[in-house]
Structure formats: structure tokens, C-alpha cells
Amino acid sequence: MSSKYPRSVRRCLPLWALTLEAALILLFYFFTHYDASLEDQKGLVASYQVGQDLTVMAAIGLGFLTSSFRRHSWSSVAFNLFMLALGVQWAILLDGFLSQFPSGKVVITLFSIRLATMSALSVLISVDAVLGKVNLAQLVVMVLVEVTALGNLRMVISNIFNTDYHMNMMHIYVFAAYFGLSVAWCLPKPLPEGTEDKDQTATIPSLSAMLGALFLWMFWPSFNSALLRSPIERKNAVFNTYYAVAVSVVTAISGSSLAHPQGKISKTYVHSAVLAGGVAVGTSCHLIPSPWLAMVLGLVAGLISVGGAKYLPGCCNRVLGIPHSSIMGYNFSLLGLLGEIIYIVLLVLDTVGAGNGMIGFQVLLSIGELSLAIVIALMSGLLTGLLLNLKIWKAPHEAKYFDDQVFWKFPHLAVGF
């Protein structure tokens, strides 16, 4: 007969998720209200469009990007949506509590929804390393811990290093990558006999993963510019991100062909590498003074991404138990670091140009921020991994990793596997 959730999880998941949702509703009831001061309705529409772009990136882009497994595509898309919906709610409250609460109620604006969507995106990046090996109850825990850790990281960085919204949110790439990798490291690693086929990619899901990559590619300029403060900064960010992702597409496809003995193009490389430029340019997208620099950065990022996709999966599979097609984690970790290094280079160049003696101090601050982001990601990721290993969550048995049938009702299937 077809496989079902174990009885205990069938009781635990709805109870856990609905209790949490009820708690969130109560928190919203007591502690939040809308910003009532908006005068300009046209401004509202323009502001909403940015948030809409971010939601499309999260729900469709990252949802489908992670759906390339042969027998785990439904779960990838739907679980992403579930995590996004939960993550946004908690992120809005958390950001409000951390930044506004002493002054009374949390004021909800379109900007706070934007911030919350970006915080939830962090979870969707991280989860790529563990999707297929965890159930929804475990994912709820992951969402809560990661959003909380990122929110606190952003607050600490903002207060200690005096970093603005854009700069402290751009640590998301490195944070999400290291968080996901450290969670994966804690989970049972060896794929048992008989499941090797399930973590392979198939044509239809791979096509939907490519669709996800295309949506991310289209909207990455919105992501990189969403939190910037002035039109000129947003314009620079949009242009530079666009040039960087355009070049990384060309690099990804040609680099993938170059990396294959028969000159064939790998779907997995392309899914991930097309986004490389957007990640690498993120931190400094509003500061890069001319298009050619963004394009060079896109080229380098594309090459690093393809190189990483070729040589790192073996290591990641052995050490972390991450399947070959889930390369977002190490990809974003490398490219996020590249982006941070580019920012430090710009910092040094600018400071030298100004003939100022503050170089060491500024560089130290930037390295401090980055180190803090990595440390908090690793620590909170390990904590999450340990929590997910608790028996209470009734994790899927290793023989049922990467399998939609464990979670979904398929009426046309008479029997299981």
C-alpha cells in the first residue's frame, strides 16, 4: 500500500504548525499595526512592486530551483512555499521586536514586508542542503531558528558596526550557505542502498529547476537593490547586477561545456552558475562605478561557480551528505565570500584615493562583520542540526529520503515502492 506519514508525525505536524500559527496571529493582534501615514498611493504601488519581485524570486525562483530531484520535486516546491509563508510572518514580528518594540507597537510597512521576505529567502537558500532528508515539522524548526539567528545577526551588525539595511542583508548569501551546510553536516549522511536513483535529477524536474533559475535571474536586480536608500543607489545596483548576471550566464554555459570532456553542458552547473554574478556583486552592487567592472565580476563569479560545481560535489557528498545537484550551499558560500572581498577591495581603493589613514580600521570592521556572520551561521546551523536530530520530529527514514510519496497523496498510485 502507498506510504504515509508515520502516525506520530501525522499528529505532531498539524498540531505543531497550527499552534505556531495561532501564536503568530495572537502576536500580530497584540503587538502590530499598519503604518497609517502614507499619503501617496502611486508610491505605494511602486513600493509594492519591489516586494512582489522578491516574493516571485522566493516562491517561484527558489521553489523551482530546488525541484530537480527525480522523486522529490513536489515536496521541494511546496515545502519552499510553506517555509516562505511561515518565515515571512515570523521575520516581520522579529524585525519589529528587535528594532521598534521599545517605542510601543510594531509598525508594519511595505518595507518591513520586503525585509521579512529577504530574511525568509535565507531559509530557502539554506534548505537546499537538507531538502529530501527532513520533514515539514523539522523545517518549521529550521525556519524559526534561522530567521531568528539572521534577525539577531542583522541587529548586532547594525548596532555594533553601524551598517545599513543593504549591507547587513547582503551577508545573507554567506550566512545562508554556512547555515545550510552546518545543518546538513549534522544530519545522517550516508545515502542507503536503493536510494541512489532518487537523488538523481530527471528531465521534467530539471526543466522546472531551470525555470526557477530563470525567475531568479530576471529578478536578481530587484533583490540587490530592494533595501537601498536613494534612487541613484538603486539604479546603480540594478544596472550592475544586470550586467553581472548577464555575463555569468554566458560564462556558465560556455564554462560548463569547457569543463566536460565531450564539451557537453551540465544542467546542474547552469542552474546555479547563471546566478553567480548576482551573488558576487550583491554587497557592492550600488558602489561599482562602471559596467565593465560588474561584467568582470560576473565572469569571475561564473568561472568560480562552474569550477566549484565540478570539483566540490564529491567532497560535499562525502562529508556533508549533500547530493550532487544541491550545489547552492557551497556555491553561495564561495560567491558570497567573493562579494565580501570585492567590497573590501573597494573600501581600500576608496580610502587610498581619499588619502586617508582609516584603511586598517575600516577593513577590520568589514572583516569583523563577515566573521561574525559566518560564526553565527555555523553555530546556529549546528544548533538547528542537533535539534533536527531529536526523535520527537520523526524524521523520514533514510530509505525514504528524496521521496514525494512519503509526504504527498498520489491518487493514481495503487502501491508504494
Epitope: 518595507f111 539595511y165 536613494s230 576608496d350 582609516m358
Partner: antibody, heavy 125, light 107 residues
Framework: EVQLLESGGGVVQPGRSLRLSCVVS????????MHWVRQAPGKGLEWVAV????????YYADSVKGRFTISRDNSKNTLYLQMNSLRAEDTAVYYC??????????????????WGQGTLVTVSS | AELTQSPSSLSASVGDRVTITCRAS??????LNWYQQKPGKAPKLLIY???SLQSGVPSRFSGSGSGTDFTLTISSLQPEDFATYYC??????????FGQGTKLEIK
């Protein structure tokens, strides 16, 4: 020519409300962040609030947080300051100021390049 | 960051070289601006980014410094320069603050 013109000031009793307006001309209003700065009689300048170019973000000085609300209507080229629960210490000349920027090192630096002439608010019983 | 200006008032003569200092309670890099205000008038921007002269401002005004110590220098005082001068930091993107002001008077 860039112009900022404040209005709405006057005498008001403690605990009451007042709404200041700042109508601008001579530049594209929706490209700039805007600020309110005040100056109590015989005292120095005190920053009050800022609103981003698209109205998406607002910050306030601790002394006015929860009582004052900054807003803008880009279609009317107008900046507002809604002042509730006014106190005697809110008595001041209120200036609106345009925020401009320069790219410096690896960040943008902001400064106030144009100011209005100010409107006097007197809170007295 | 708190800003402290010194001196709080200063008497000088036309033609004098005058220096006003502004000290920040923590490092603010070069995120410091200087304004001039005459009685009954709105403030006017003189210097931004610690040392950049605003267009239309006479070249006798200059700014320097970074980190915590900044100076505004008027190389040769003119009659129209007698006013109150304020420093202002924009390092903290949530909080802008001004110094308490330096009143420059005719000796």
C-alpha cells in the same frame, strides 16, 4: 531654483496636535530623502526625522518617537510632519531640509544641501 | 555618535584665521558636515564629507579630519562670516546629530 516652503506653524496648547507642511519646487521631489530639523529659541539645531525618497522608511529622534510622524506625498511635492501630544519643549522653529549624497569610500554620505526658511511652533498654555 | 564643538563662542577680527573643532564620541570616518547659520535665517551647507567644499561657498572655508577629530578653518575672516557654525554627523544612518554650535563674534 530650489525652494522649500514650510507652513502650518502657530501657537498650540500642550497635549494638542499640529501638522506642518513643506511644499518644494525646483527639483524632482521623489528623488530625494527629506528631513525635519528644529531649533528651540536661542538653542542649537536638533534633528527630528527623516523619510526616504519613496516613503518606505522613516526614522525619528528619541525625543519625538511615538508622537511625531513624518510622511510625504510625492504627487503633491509635499512633506509633512504630524505632531501629536505636543509639549512645551517642542517649541521651536521647524525646518524642512533636502538630503543629498556623495559616494564616499564604500558608502554614501548624506548631507542637507537645501533648507526651508522655517516655521515657528509655540506650545504654550 | 555625540558631537562636541569647541570653543562654544569665539571672538575674532576681520582678516583673522579661525579654527573651530568638532570631536565625535566614536569614530565616524569622514561622515561629517559643517553648516553656517546667521540669526533669523536657515542653516547653509559649507562643507560635506569632512573636507569637500559645497559649490558656491568661498574657498577661504576648508574642512579636515577623519575618525573622531575634525576642524573647520576660515583662512581670512570676512564681515559676512560672523555667524554660528554647526558640525553634523551622518555616520549613523538612523540618527543624525549636530554639535552644540560655535558662535563666531566680532572682536
Amino acid at each position: 531654483e530650489v525652494q522649500l516652503l514650510e507652513s502650518g506653524g502657530g501657537v498650540v496648547q500642550p497635549g494638542r496636535s499640529l501638522r506642518l507642511s513643506c511644499v518644494v519646487s525646483g527639483f524632482t521631489f521623489n528623488n530625494y530623502g527629506m528631513h525635519w530639523v528644529r531649533q528651540a529659541p536661542g538653542k542649537g539645531l536638533e534633528w527630528v526625522a527623516v523619510i526616504w525618497f519613496d516613503g518606505s522608511n522613516k526614522y525619528y529622534a528619541d525625543s519625538v518617537k511615538g508622537r511625531f510622524t513624518i510622511s510625504r506625498d510625492n504627487s503633491k511635492n509635499t512633506l509633512y510632519l504630524q505632531m501629536n501630544s505636543l509639549r512645551a519643549e517642542d517649541t521651536a522653529v521647524y525646518y524642512c531640509a533636502r538630503e543629498n549624497q556623495i559616494k564616499l569610500w564604500s558608502r554614501y554620505l548624506y548631507y542637507f544641501d537645501y533648507w526651508g526658511q522655517g516655521t515657528l511652533v509655540t506650545v504654550s498654555s | 555618535a555625540e558631537l562636541t564643538q569647541s570653543p562654544s563662542s569665539l571672538s575674532a577680527s576681520v582678516g583673522d584665521r579661525v579654527t573651530i573643532t568638532c570631536r565625535a564620541s566614536q569614530s565616524i570616518s569622514s561622515y561629517l558636515n559643517w553648516y553656517q547659520q546667521k540669526p533669523g535665517k536657515a542653516p547653509k551647507l559649507l562643507i560635506y564629507a569632512a573636507s569637500s567644499l559645497q559649490s558656491g561657498v568661498p574657498s577661504r572655508f576648508s574642512g579636515s579630519g577623519s575618525g573622531t577629530d575634525f576642524t573647520l578653518t576660515i583662512s581670512s575672516l570676512q564681515p559676512e562670516d560672523f555667524a554660528t557654525y554647526y558640525c553634523q554627523q551622518s555616520y549613523s544612518f538612523r540618527r543624525y546629530s549636530f554639535g552644540q554650535g560655535t558662535k563666531l563674534e566680532i572682536k
